[in-house]
């Protein structure tokens, strides 16, 4: 008898090379075979459970950056007046949540902020829980 | 043939809104369907393996806080003279371990410390290993 | 029918008590039943996917320490002029990668650096993905 295989874990790595003031960061998924999807510049959550979240990036200007998952809820991350980020967190997310950026800069002298090494990773920690596809 | 499902991962999120000097923090599990249990103000470990541990909170007074798992062993986290915590760690825990707080304050003018956003998350990282229920 | 068990997750905890200038840290695996292996002072990656990485240690001298996984790629961790480390990260690693230390000290008066509590943990986060053994 063949031992059972793991179904694929819900996870995604998105990259971002540009953020816009009063908007967010433009995210792209470099891999076609990710188990989670990007839609309207947000990562779509289909499975309830804890997620390991890693956020990295080096910014061309000082900015304030927040990562949200649901309207009316506090941010997953919130960084004020930084030029880089390297943070890890754990959060409980649920079906219908959407993970997206909000960015504020403190100058009007530039249109956008360049990002080197911009990377956001989400990894589901509770396979076997509720998922809706 | 139905593809195999993951058995539920051992994980828990507990909240704490109050810590007592020379004692610990009073933890409660907001969800009834957690796969790990709270007993005598401690989280009970049934499964051997690595655990991802997330600890957050904002305290009404400066305190020193440690998170222990076994008598005679060093703490999982140890924070000295802080008013907030936002930490992530990885530790190997085993059956019979119990995860609990110890708190010390540096003033005699109050008994209790109020906590906003007090949250402790444990997520087992080695399903398939030894568990005793 | 017996519910399916998880196959063991790829994970390892190595310890290091000594680092050598211009070289690395001598790593040993205290447990015989780890699911990952150490070879030539490197941790061998057999499975593609995200890894949770925890690095801790207290050093007898100030040093600069990097943790690499592939020639020509940036480090997983890079710490400059530190006497301790307690870091967590997430990285995508793949078959044929090797995780190893590089250390530089800033004194010629000693060859070896002693390490207390030196620990490196890797935990695979994408079971079910590609593995080569």
């Amino acid at each position: 008898q063949v031992p059972p295989q793991y179904p694929p874990i819900q996870s995604i790595r998105v990259q971002f090379t540009r953020c816009e003031n009063e908007k967010g960061c433009i995210i792209t998924s470099p891999s076609k075979d990710e188990t989670m999807k990007v839609q309207d510049n947000s990562i779509i959550i289909n499975c309830d459970g804890f997620y390991l979240i890693s956020l990295k990036g080096y910014f061309s200007e000082e900015l304030s950056l927040s990562l949200y998952y649901r309207k009316g809820r506090g941010p997953l991350f919130s960084l004020s007046k930084v030029t880089s980020v390297d943070s890890i967190g754990v959060a409980y997310l649920a079906f219908k949540d959407k993970v997206y950026f909000n960015v504020t800069t403190h100058s009007t002298s530039y249109k956008d902020i360049q990002v080197n090494g911009g990377e956001l990773i989400l990894i589901h920690q509770n396979p076997g829980g509720f998922c809706a596809y | 043939q139905v593809p195999p499902q993951y058995p539920p991962i051992q994980s828990i999120r507990v909240q704490f809104t109050r810590c007592e000097n020379e004692k610990g923090c009073i933890i409660t599990s907001p969800s009834k369907d957690e796969t790990m249990k709270v007993q005598d103000n401690s989280i009970i470990i049934n499964c051997d393996g690595f655990y991802l541990i997330s600890l957050k909170g904002y305290f009404s007074e400066e305190l020193s806080l440690s998170l222990y798992y076994r008598k005679g062993r060093g703490p999982l986290f140890s924070l000295s003279k802080v008013t907030s915590v936002d930490s992530i760690g990885v530790a190997y825990l085993a059956f019979k371990d119990k995860v609990y707080f110890n708190v010390t304050t540096h003033s005699t003018s109050y008994k209790d410390i109020q906590v906003n956003g007090g949250e402790l998350i444990l997520i087992h990282q080695n399903p398939g290993g030894f568990c005793a229920y | 029918q017996v519910p399916p068990q998880y196959p063991p997750i790829q994970s390892i905890r190595v310890q290091f008590t000594r680092c050598e200038n211009e070289k690395g840290c001598i790593i040993t695996s205290p447990s015989k039943d780890e699911t990952m292996k150490v070879q030539d002072n490197s941790i061998i990656i057999n499975c593609d996917g995200f890894y949770l990485i925890s690095l801790k240690g207290y050093f007898s001298e100030e040093l600069s320490l990097s943790l690499y996984y592939r020639k020509g790629r940036g480090p997983l961790f890079s710490l400059s002029k530190v006497t301790s480390v307690d870091s967590i990260g997430v990285a995508y690693l793949a078959f044929k990668d090797k995780v190893y230390f590089n250390v530089t000290t800033h004194s010629t008066s000693y060859k070896d650096i002693q390490v207390n509590g030196g620990e490196l943990i890797l935990i695979h986060q994408n079971p079910g993905g590609f593995c080569a053994y």
């Epitope: 061309s60 530039y110 956008d112 360049q114 | - | 940036g74 890079s78 400059s80």
Partner: antibody
């Protein structure tokens, strides 16, 4: 005063290797991203590689990917460019640059000449 | 990859305005930086974020950027402004330079 001093340029044969160094002073090295920019004789500027403040993020122009490696030693205030499998078209003056606002190349060294010829 | 197009050379009469252009697809949506390189010297930043001047750069240098063209303007060119001028942008974590324009002051 900000100073960037490159060294390591030389005459090398095709397929050879070199390591360029850039020692900096006058600013807190580990607070700034760095880049290498090159200029072939009589030609324009070409960006070569970028490295973040801590060395964990790097990027390269397509022409050098897999052959060049940028690195830094913050303790020694030194930026490096390891060059392998050299080609004649890699002949150029290589400038070390400090990144400023907007990832501009705010300060430049005087350059070091790499000549690839058989 | 993103391409920036500059005219190889441009002549200007002493004390007259000089306009150096840099073309790129929808370049107006990007931040453009300009560098001056005098003969035998390393380049130097003269304009950043389309139109901002670093400390020490004379007021006669200005910049603009919209549509598919960014422009560096020298309001009254001096002999010391004879040099090569390069535009630069970042695109997807990769930096791109224009081919450069050699400005001759007559």
């Amino acid at each position: 005063e900000v100073q960037l001093v490159e060294s390591g340029g030389d005459l090398v044969k095709p397929e050879g290797s070199l390591r360029l160094s850039c020692v900096v002073s006058g600013f807190t090295f580990n607070n700034y991203g760095m880049s290498w920019v090159r200029q072939a004789p009589g030609k324009g500027l070409q960006w070569v590689a970028y490295i973040s403040i801590d060395g964990r993020s790097t990027s390269y122009t397509d022409a050098v990917k897999g052959r060049f490696t940028i690195s830094r030693d913050n303790a020694k205030n030194t930026l490096y460019l390891h060059i392998n499998s050299l080609r004649t078209e890699d002949t150029a003056v290589y400038y070390c640059t400090k990144l400023g606002r907007g990832f501009t190349f705010g300060y430049w060294g005087q350059g070091t000449l790499v000549t690839v010829s058989s | 990859s993103y391409v920036l197009t500059q005219l190889p050379s441009k002549n200007v009469t002493l004390k007259q305005p000089a306009h150096i252009t840099c073309g790129g697809d929808n370049i107006g949506s990007k931040s453009v930086h300009w560098y001056q390189q005098k003969l035998g010297q390393a380049p130097a930043l003269i304009i950043y974020y389309d139109s901002s001047r670093p400390t020490g750069i004379p007021e006669r240098f200005s910049g603009a950027n919209s549509g598919n063209t960014a422009t560096l303007t020298i309001s009254g060119a001096l002999a010391e402004d004879e040099a090569d001028y390069y535009c630069q942008v970042w695109d997807s974590s990769v930096s791109v330079f224009g081919g450069g324009t050699h400005l001759t002051v007559l």
